[in-house]
Amino acid sequence: MKTWVKIVFGVATSAVLALLVMCIVLRPSRVHNSEENTMRALTLKDILNGTFSYKTFFPNWISGQEYLHQSADNNIVLYNIETGQSYTILSNRTMKSVNASNYGLSPDRQFVYLESDYSKLWRYSYTATYYIYDLSNGEFVRGNELPRPIQYLCWSPVGSKLAYVYQNNIYLKQRPGDPPFQITFNGRENKIFNGIPDWVYEEEMLATKYALWWSPNGKFLAYAEFNDTDIPVIAYSYYGDEQYPRTINIPYPKAGAKNPVVRIFIIDTTYPAYVGPQEVPVPAMIASSDYYFSWLTWVTDERVCLQWLKRVQNVSVLSICDFREDWQTWDCPKTQEHIEESRTGWAGGFFVSTPVFSYDAISYYKIFSDKDGYKHIHYIKDTVENAIQITSGKWEAINIFRVTQDSLFYSSNEFEEYPGRRNIYRISIGSYPPSKKCVTCHLRKERCQYYTASFSDYAKYYALVCYGPGIPISTLHDGRTDQEIKILEENKELENALKNIQLPKEEIKKLEVDEITLWYKMILPPQFDRSKKYPLLIQVYGGPCSQSVRSVFAVNWISYLASKEGMVIALVDGRGTAFQGDKLLYAVYRKLGVYEVEDQITAVRKFIEMGFIDEKRIAIWGWSYGGYVSSLALASGTGLFKCGIAVAPVSSWEYYASVYTERFMGLPTKDDNLEHYKNSTVMARAEYFRNVDYLLIHGTADDNVHFQNSAQIAKALVNAQVDFQAMWYSDQNHGLSGLSTNHLYTHMTHFLKQCFSLSD
């Protein structure tokens, strides 16, 4: 359940264009009245048309100093930073000849795959048709063409071998024109998945469409096999246009149900028929009960690192395995097993972190909780107990981008103690003193406080992508000096388009309540006057390890509600949210639906005390986990909320996916946590909806949070004879995309305006 990512960057985002000054973000006041008169408020149409969307530039690195980029006219262009030269390697004409929407250059630069007929499946997965174009002769490779549709395809890291998944089996080509070698034969729809994840692994564990990994020089190919034979199936109708609806069947393990059985295999791609795929052994302490595979990291061509997780997700084991030439097998000695255990919650943050290996090919850097309960970078040489802590403080390291011989690049929220910021740091690891430098903190301090980065080979160059709070900008930098080389994308058109728009004001501040820090973002109408009273809308996500209060740019629905409709919108990060230490994060462990709701209510009470909120006009809305929290808040019996909206809410944790739910809730069994599973449903609170206006919304083809969740809420409300409003979106999934998006936001706008007695 990762809707919060979508909510942060999609149409339903919460941040707006802002310049953060002393934590309050204010637009410069206009001097001339004539200029003020030309300003207009945002319209709902602006939002639905994506008028104020922004662009980012992530180079497709192909060496230390070269990258590919698709130009505005769809040519694929190779840029050389050192020479300053660029040339088109693939014309838009060639792209158009097969209606290609994506491409991939082989590492030997001889071939390009072109991807067309994109057909979305789940969050990351899709099928497509692939064509191979030979750059040396300017022709498509004929003979032994690839089958269609393919579920996943990738080049080897060296040369131009191809691995692909077709009908749940893995195939290998030594050269694009060669006949394929079939690696697996047991693949079967909805039963056995080779090289691609099943639904739950894709959504809740790997967060990728693939489950195969080439070794660094392409000698070996590792892959996962998922056996879903015993998993219960979720079935729902897809109405389509035919006389009879189709039934969609997905093996989907809900909390406590039978899980997929995973095995990892490695095959020598040079002589694939010699010994065939060899299974990698599972650590004994993991194999003794239900378990998950969580990630695979190649260290060298003959050393691989696997991470495993117990079904009760507080114990993770990292296992380093070596190839034994004499036996042609993979050996995972116990001495190379590293255990990571949480005594206060689950292992890791949202996922267990992955290792970044150093040049000795055995020691590595990894983010995990320190003794004070903050996630920090540690260096592991022999045992986890002897880990050397690299970063420390009452803040968190978020991501390790790259480790070179002498530097480690990472992101954190250390700077100025704002958890919702991200800056990039460089730590020297081969010199004294062990200097730490913030690469981004002072670059564009007001405009840019939330960065990510993308590094070329050996970190010779890197791109910085700033997401806000000002207009996003992407820049290219020298990896040795950190000097800015050029601007890759600065969103000039967006900047010009916003010049006559009355954007809301935005502030990020914190509330201190009973030893808990509640960070909030408040979006205020353009002519905000503290002496007046405004309707308040709370936007909530609140899921474990999420973060809503972030210093990022967005012009979206809530920006419009503040700008045009004069609402105050607030987002609050309460207990269970991320990047502020384990105490806050793990507070919700085994008790979902309690503290997240309490903290939203506490914040609303504090907002009322500020004096500018009309306490008779307060609403709450959320999507996915946020729909669950908004529903529980509305049914809290506090009388604070006049109305609220739940989009695609979870209504009972027994209905949601095992991997996600059990991580935070344990099992729904009598001897584990069944009692809280039962106590935390929305249905159990049906009676409490009597005094609020409730709008319940769901897509009927939601593969993630099944329509079942809203069906059960509706049934409970009807049985309790409680009036409510509802909207379903036929054949729409968890994202409610396309025309449904327009309908959804128009419908929710009407609902809120009616609730707040605002004229249409």
């Epitope: 050397i388 690299i390 970063t391 420390s392 403080g393 690891i429 081969g430 004294y432 062990p434």
Partner: nanobody, 118 residues
Framework: EVQLVESGGGLVQPGGSLRLSCAAS????????MGWFRQAPGKGRELVAA????????YYPDSVEGRFTISRDNAKRMVYLQMNSLRAEDTAVYYC???????????WGQGTQVTVSS
């Protein structure tokens, strides 16, 4: 938390040698950047040796390079400073220090006096 206790200081003649020891308790000392500092009367604290836990690389200022050697024994949780060819200007209180990678030295011993005099 790390507790550090120095020993081995004393009076020594110019050209002589001395070996300082630092016993670490609490968190394991090999997890930390370790160093020896000194402070002469009326002067600021200066680093004389440091040892990197990542690769056991050692660092010395020019003033002691070739004369002082820092080493560690992880099993015994000890850090040593071997001082040879001592000079009068080496007279100071010597402190053992430990620290996290990114926050430098935040744990300190009480210090041990070294006097070089004839």
């Amino acid at each position: 938390e790390v507790q550090l206790v120095e020993s081995g200081g004393g009076l020594v003649q110019p050209g002589g040698s001395l070996r300082l020891s630092c016993a670490a308790s609490g968190s394991t000392s090999n997890n930390y950047f370790m160093g020896w500092f000194r402070q002469a009367p009326g002067k600021g604290r200066e680093l004389v040796a440091a040892i990197n836990p990542l690769d056991s690389n050692t660092y010395y200022p020019d003033s002691v390079e070739g004369r002082f050697t820092i080493s560690r024994d992880n099993a015994k949780r000890m850090v040593y400073l071997q001082m040879n060819s001592l000079r009068a200007e080496d007279t100071a209180v010597y402190y053992c220090a430990a620290g996290h990678w990114d926050s430098h030295f935040n744990y300190w011993g009480q210090g041990t006096q070294v006097t070089v005099s004839s």
